[in-house]
């Protein structure tokens, strides 16, 4: 806390300007009127205050707005935003996307801080859903944002927002998240033609069920191995050798290099060896010829 001291004669601030950088902390506290600061917040960011000085300015705003800052002040916080705690931010009501952008800009190039996470949470909750413009903004600043959300939070993403998602935005998503996002993507891109559809849906395929993979295998999509390796194991297992061959097209040769890794390894174990041999890749570990395969999961379902 800064001690309450009288402002020295002639030092009372009449406006927020560069002269204030030469004020000591106690002088800022004594000589800068909080209401003046609030109305001229847009000037603060252009003035090279130290963070020590910004602490004093924050203290003045906190006294003026104990219930939380109005959006007119929040929008112009600039670097002062970095001095806010998550507790401060929870008092705010941020409704403007421009305000959100202005504050995210301050943290640009740095990883998401607890302040930013709280701000985004407040903003999204206030909007009720993660609309396309918000998602566009958030993924532009934080490509990994989408994958930081829980499956429950992702369920509030409308299919229309999926158009804003870039492949790199999904890099760190786990299967549970892709399970939620894939149906939305399928819905969003449903009116596109085959090759265009595949380009858009490709990065979401880690959430695709078997029947969709079977359908894709009929469309000459030539899926690359990197995409294939991200598919759900349970979705890949029921695919036949012929379906996988059609799905991968010329990339089928890459199976050999991945034969010890999931889902390829598990898929090989489910195929007849003579079917695998038709690929001519030397894949080993299939079911020997003459063996009968019992699907016990089906048996359990029937009993």
């Amino acid at each position: 806390e800064v001690e309450k001291t009288a402002c020295p004669s002639g030092k009372k601030a009449r406006e927020i300007d560069e002269s204030l950088i030469f004020y000591k902390k106690w002088e800022l506290e004594a000589c800068v009127d909080a209401a003046l600061l609030a109305t001229q917040m847009d000037r603060v960011n252009a003035i090279p205050f130290t963070y020590e000085q910004l602490d004093v300015l924050k203290h003045k705003l906190d006294e003026l707005y104990p219930q939380g800052y109005p959006e007119s002040v929040i929008q112009h916080l600039g670097y002062l935003f970095l001095k806010m705690s998550p507790e401060d931010i929870r008092k705010w009501n941020v409704t403007s996307l421009e305000t959100l952008k202005a504050l995210l800009e301050v943290n640009k190039g740095h990883e998401m801080s607890p302040q930013v996470a709280t701000l985004i949470d407040r903003f999204v909750k206030g909007r009720g859903q993660l609309d396309k413009d918000t998602l566009d903004t958030l993924t532009a600043f934080y490509p990994g944002y989408l994958c930081s959300l829980s499956p429950e939070e992702l369920s509030s993403v409308p299919p229309s927002s999926i158009w804003a998602v870039r492949p790199q935005d999904l890099d760190t998503c786990d299967p549970r998240q892709l399970d939620v996002l894939y149906p939305k993507a399928r819905l969003a891109f449903q009116n596109m033609n085959g090759s265009e559809y595949f380009v858009k849906i490709q990065s979401f395929l880690g959430g695709a069920p078997t029947e969709d993979l079977k359908a894709l295998s009929q469309q000459n999509v030539s899926m690359d191995l990197a995409t294939f390796m991200k598919l759900r194991t349970d979705a890949v297992l029921p695919l036949t050798v012929a379906e996988v061959q059609k799905l991968l097209g010329p990339h089928v040769e890459g199976l050999k290099a991945e034969e010890r890794h999931r889902p390829v390894r598990d898929w090989i174990l489910r195929q007849r060896q003579d079917d695998l041999d038709t690929l001519g890749l030397g894949l080993q570990g299939g079911i020997p010829n003459g063996y009968l395969v019992l699907d016990l999961s089906m048996q359990e379902a029937l009993s």
Epitope: P48, T50, Y51, Y79, K83, N107, G109, H110
Partner: nanobody, 115 residues
Framework: EVQLVESGGGLIQPGGSLRLSCAAS????????MGWHRQAPGKGRELVST???????YYANFVKGRFTISRDNSKNTLYLQMNSLRAEDTAVYYC?????????WGQGTLVTVSS
């Protein structure tokens, strides 16, 4: 993290000149502006001069026309050229970098102006 190391201080006669240097290392890309502060014996620390990343400079009234702040981005070094030195300029001079999201300080270099 940003590390700052000052040098160039020493004993100088009134009217003489000195050039202080501050070498910055670490996460220098996060620096927004840098400055020189000083603390005279028995007094509080005060800002002498600041320079922004775009080269805008600011000077305290007590050094205007005598001191010049500059930076060499290729060497990641901040300078303070001090001319016409007076006895009242005697102080420990500190380099400061305001970077994301805090202020970083050097350990200081002592300047003594005395005949």
């Amino acid at each position: 993290e940003v590390q700052l190391v000052e040098s160039g201080g020493g004993l100088i006669q009134p009217g003489g000149s000195l050039r202080l240097s501050c070498a910055a290392s670490g996460n220098i890309g996060s620096i927004r502006h840098m400055g020189w502060h000083r603390q005279a014996p028995g007094k509080g620390r005060e800002l002498v001069s600041t320079i922004t990343t775009v080269g805008t400079t600011y000077y305290a009234n007590f050094v205007k026309g005598r001191f010049t702040i500059s930076r060499d981005n290729s060497k990641n070094t901040l300078y303070l050229q001090m001319n016409s030195l007076r006895a009242e300029d005697t102080a420990v001079y500190y380099c400061r970098a305001t970077a994301h999201p805090t202020d970083y300080w050097g350990q200081g270099t002592l300047v003594t102006v005395s005949s």
